[in-house]
Amino acid sequence: EVEKTACPSGKKAREIDESLIFYKKWELEACVDAALLATQMDRVNAIPFTYEQLDVLKHKLDELYPQGYPESVIQHLGYLFLKMSPEDIRKWNVTSLETLKALLEVNKGHEMSPQVATLIDRFVKGRGQLDKDTLDTLTAFYPGYLCSLSPEELSSVPPSSIWAVRPQDLDTCDPRQLDVLYPKARLAFQNMNGSEYFVKIQSFLGGAPTEDLKALSQQNVSMDLATFMKLRTDAVLPLTVAEVQKLLGPHVEGLKAEERHRPVRDWILRQRQDDLDTLGLGLQGGIPNGYLVLDLSMQEALS
């Protein structure tokens, strides 16, 4: 807390300019009018204030706006944003995408800070849903943003927003998140033709059910092994050798390199060795010839 002291004669600030960098902390407190600061916030960023001086400017704004800053001030905070705490930000009502962009720009190149996370949370909650423009902006600054959301939060993403998602935005998503995103992506891309559809849906396939994988196997998609390895194990297990061969196309020989990794390992264990041998890849671990396969889950359902 800076002491209240009178402003020395002739030092009263008439505008926010470079001369203020020579002011001591107490002089800034005494000589800069908070209302003037609020109207000329856009100038602060261009002036090389010290961190201590910025603390004083923040204090003045806090006194002027105890209930939270108006958006006209927030939009021009610049580096002063880095001085804000999550508690400060929770008082704000940010509705403009331009304001959000301006503040994200300040933090660009750094990991998402608690301040940024709070700002995004306030912004998205204010909008009611994660629309395409917002998602575009957020993933541009933070490629991993989408995967930082809970499945519940992701459920508020409208299918139209999925068009903004790039493959790298999904790199850190877990299966539960893809379970939510996949149906939205399927809906978003439903009017595309076969090959174009596959290019778009590929990144979301970690949430695809068996019947969709079977359908894809009929479309000559040539799925690569990196994508295949991300599929849900429970979705892969019911696929036949012929279906997997069609799904992977020329990439089918890659199964050998991944035969000990899930879901390939578990899928191999469910196939007849005879059928696996037709691939000519040397895959081992299938059900030996002459063995009867009982689907116990089916039997339980019937009893």
Epitope: P167, D171, A226, M229, K256, A257, E258, E259, G282
Partner: antibody, heavy 119, light 108 residues
Framework: EVQLVQSGAEVKKPGASVKVSCKAS????????MDWVRQAPGQGLEWMGD????????IYNQKFSGRVTMTEDKSASTVYMELSSLRSEDTAVYYC????????????WGQGTTVTVSS | EIVLTQSPDFQSVTPKEKVTITCSAS???????LSWYQQKPDQSPKLLIY???NLASGVPSRFSGSGSGTDFTLTINSLEAEDAATYYC?????????FGGGTKVEIK
């Protein structure tokens, strides 16, 4: 440019553990498995195991089972190899090597990390 | 596990001469699953040939590979000074993946 940059040399006492990191850059991290291969002084190459950075799934050479643990941090595009209960014969250069998912050959290697186990 | 035995262990060769290194497997290896690596002193290994005969990116055409079943060969058609290195064969046809013991090629 595709690069695998490993952590620096380590000197450990018998019975201790060592954790080597391998940071990947210049490619899509989740499209490639990361394998670990070691080379004892004046000896040949020995495959230790691999990790799929996308799923976190690991496969270990049985020779190291129970002693080796491979982990990944997708957000940092980094994989780790930890070897525990070290003995003098674990003295070696440890390499991480990139392997495209669906292939079995290593097209890019890290610079190697020398681990010396000595009392 | 499949044991890969390389021969010779060591070879001293004059430049421009042809070099042949063999890799013999203790049981059959599917040819798509065999590769060769080159390692120069104090350097990491480098992929030379994959799938028995495919040259890796940037590898000079004087290198070639062949073979099937249990017998595989790496050939350097006209040795150059920069080829002084140790060469390893590697199989991923059977778990665990294994490497040959290496063949050191020295320039006379």
């Amino acid at each position: 440019e595709v690069q695998l940059v490993q952590s620096g040399a380590e000197v450990k006492k018998p019975g201790a553990s060592v954790k080597v990191s391998c940071k990947a850059s210049g490619y899509t991290f989740t499209d490639y498995n990361m394998d670990w291969v070691r080379q004892a002084p004046g000896q040949g190459l020995e495959w230790m195991g691999d990790i799929n950075p996308s799923t976190g799934g690991t496969i270990y050479n049985q020779k190291f089972s129970g002693r080796v643990t491979m982990t990944e941090d997708k957000s940092a595009s980094t994989v780790y190899m930890e070897l525990s209960s070290l003995r003098s014969e674990d003295t070696a250069v440890y390499y991480c090597a990139r392997r495209r998912i669906g292939t079995g050959y290593f097209d890019v290697w890290g610079q190697g990390t020398t681990v010396t186990v000595s009392s | 596990e499949i044991v890969l035995t390389q021969s010779p262990d060591f070879q001293s060769v004059t430049p421009k001469e042809k070099v042949t290194i063999t890799c013999s497997a203790s049981s059959s290896v599917i040819s798509s699953y065999l590769s060769w690596y080159q390692q120069k002193p104090d350097q990491s290994p480098k992929l030379l040939i994959y799938r028995t005969s495919n040259l890796a990116s940037g590898v000079p055409s004087r290198f070639s590979g062949s073979g099937s079943g249990t017998d595989f060969t790496l050939t350097i058609n006209s040795l150059e000074a920069e080829d002084a290195a140790t060469y390893y064969c590697h199989q991923w046809s059977s778990f665990p993946y294994t490497f040959g013991g290496g063949t050191k090629v020295e320039i006379k």
